[in-house]
Amino acid sequence: LMGGQDKPFLSARPSTVVPRGGHVALQCHYRRGFNNFMLYKEDRSHVPIFHGRIFQESFIMGPVTPAHAGTYRCRGSRPHSLTGWSAPSNPLVIMVTGNHRKPSLLAHPGPLVKSGERVILQCWSDVMFEHFFLHREGISEDPSRLVGQIHDGVSKANFSIGPLMPVLAGTYRCYGSVPHSPYQLSAPSDPLDIVITGLYEKPSLSAQPGPTVQAGENVTLSCSSWSSYDIYHLSREGEAHERRLRAVPKVNRTFQADFPLGPATHGGTYRCFGSFRALPCVWSNSSDPLLVSVTGNPSSSWPSPTEPSSKSGICRHLH
């Protein structure tokens, strides 16, 4: 029995965090063979679809409105009991998003975190949110919740994540809520990918034609390893964005990616990491840093890569 002796277990798929207009499946797990259940909401807000209705297996609720936010329970059918129904299930909180302007989400010291270390995810907004919620993509459990601290017209909350293990890597979003409607959340923050590094053998990084080049000369950085990495990630010190390329198997049995940097103008320090398609947020140890110097020009900053590079999307599969 998932829910205990006479207690069903209520769950939500894909998540308890549902966008306005979206759908959520509420499933009441009870005794095998007893699939009928009743659903009810623990507040006065009127969700008419539930009144006196009996559901089978699961109930798809939606399109959801702010009125659907709140705490739900179910009772399983128990034909031979006095009432005909089981004891109430566990409470399940459904949160509806898109009710206020989105907050911002930042990682301190940064989104690349060594295995075993901690990262602070700071959610903040100039909307005076009372609570902040942090949710990891693909997780059906309730999001973490913290009370917002208000200072200088900004409300913020610091979520401490770690010690970091592969299971904690992934795409995070945060939300805010106001006191009288704690389960009517804001629009989601922009997604933030938290990457765990240091799990596999480091790749090697080299420069063609070499680490010291003339201004205007084309430079390519090659990342390679004997490990069969699917993707390589190239990061430059002082830049928030990384570049990534699919690894190509070479005749010498190494796996390599060549990053064309274009005509050299300024130098910089580069590192590369390898990862596997199945775990896109879990990266290898960093390659040794490679300092690229450009002669005939001051070594300040390399121009932004020509192709767009996004803050998020690391943790999605590269097709």
Epitope: R20, P66, G98, N99, H100, R101, D126, V127, M128, E130, V178, P179, H180, S181
Partner: antibody
């Protein structure tokens, strides 16, 4: 600085309609819900409801369902309170106030309903 | 609805005196309580939010305390400009509800 400026006093006959405006400045209008509060002569404050300035959804207290309507003109950072089919008991000063804890208030609009 | 009971309904106090106004909620409202000052012909002024947080620009002689069901507003040393009507408000649950008000006058 944050300011809520309401429209001027209104003298109406029973059965008529009044629309009060509340123009916000000094902050991002869609960041804070707008509340409406009634103060009848010699009486206390009564919360009428609020409108979510991000989604446009109004919520009314039970005593203000039916004849009362909250609306927005987001491009002008303005919230409105409309009262239809005015009754004598609607004579009051109406305030707009923004945010979850009613941080800033308008100066109030006196609506007098009289024959 | 949550009922907010404010006391006293009116009071006289001397300049420099310490004044306390109380507000009792009919159920637990956490710390979601604000205090306001009303003066004739002026916009209401928000003094305190979240039970004990002073709004920017409000003199430090005003303070709020309490949580759950029992709350108070204290003026540590009464000044002439403090006379007016004071209201509490719970914003834990819809509909928001105000206390009945306390009229504060100078002796």
């Amino acid at each position: 600085q944050i300011q809520l400026v309401q429209s001027g006093p209104e003298l109406k006959n029973p059965g008529e309609t009044v629309k009060i405006s509340c123009k916000a400045s000094g902050y991002i209008f869609t960041n804070y819900g707008m509340n409406w509060v009634k103060q009848a002569p010699g009486k206390g404050l009564k919360w009428m409801g609020w409108i979510n300035t991000y989604t446009g959804e109004p919520t009314y207290a039970d005593d203000f369902k039916g004849r009362f309507a909250f609306s927005l003109e987001t491009s002008a950072s303005t919230a409105y309170l409309q009262i239809n089919n005015l009754k004598n008991e609607d004579t009051a000063t109406y305030f707009c106030a923004h945010g979850p804890w009613l941080a800033y208030w308008g100066q109030g609009t006196l609506v007098t309903v009289s024959t | 609805d949550i009922k907010m009971t404010q006391s006293p309904s009116s009071m006289y106090a001397s300049l420099g005196e310490r004044v306390t106004i109380t507000c009792k909620a009919s159920q637990d409202i956490n710390s979601y309580l604000s205090w306001f000052q009303l003066k004739p012909g002026k916009s209401p002024k928000t003094l305190i939010y979240r039970a004990n947080r002073l709004v920017d620009g409000v003199p430090s002689r005003f303070s709020g305390s309490g949580s759950g069901q029992d709350f108070s507003l204290t003026i540590s040393s009464l000044e002439c400009e403090d006379m007016g009507i004071y209201y509490c408000l719970q914003y834990d649950e819809l509909p928001y509800t105000f206390g009945g008000g306390t009229t504060l006058e100078i002796k």
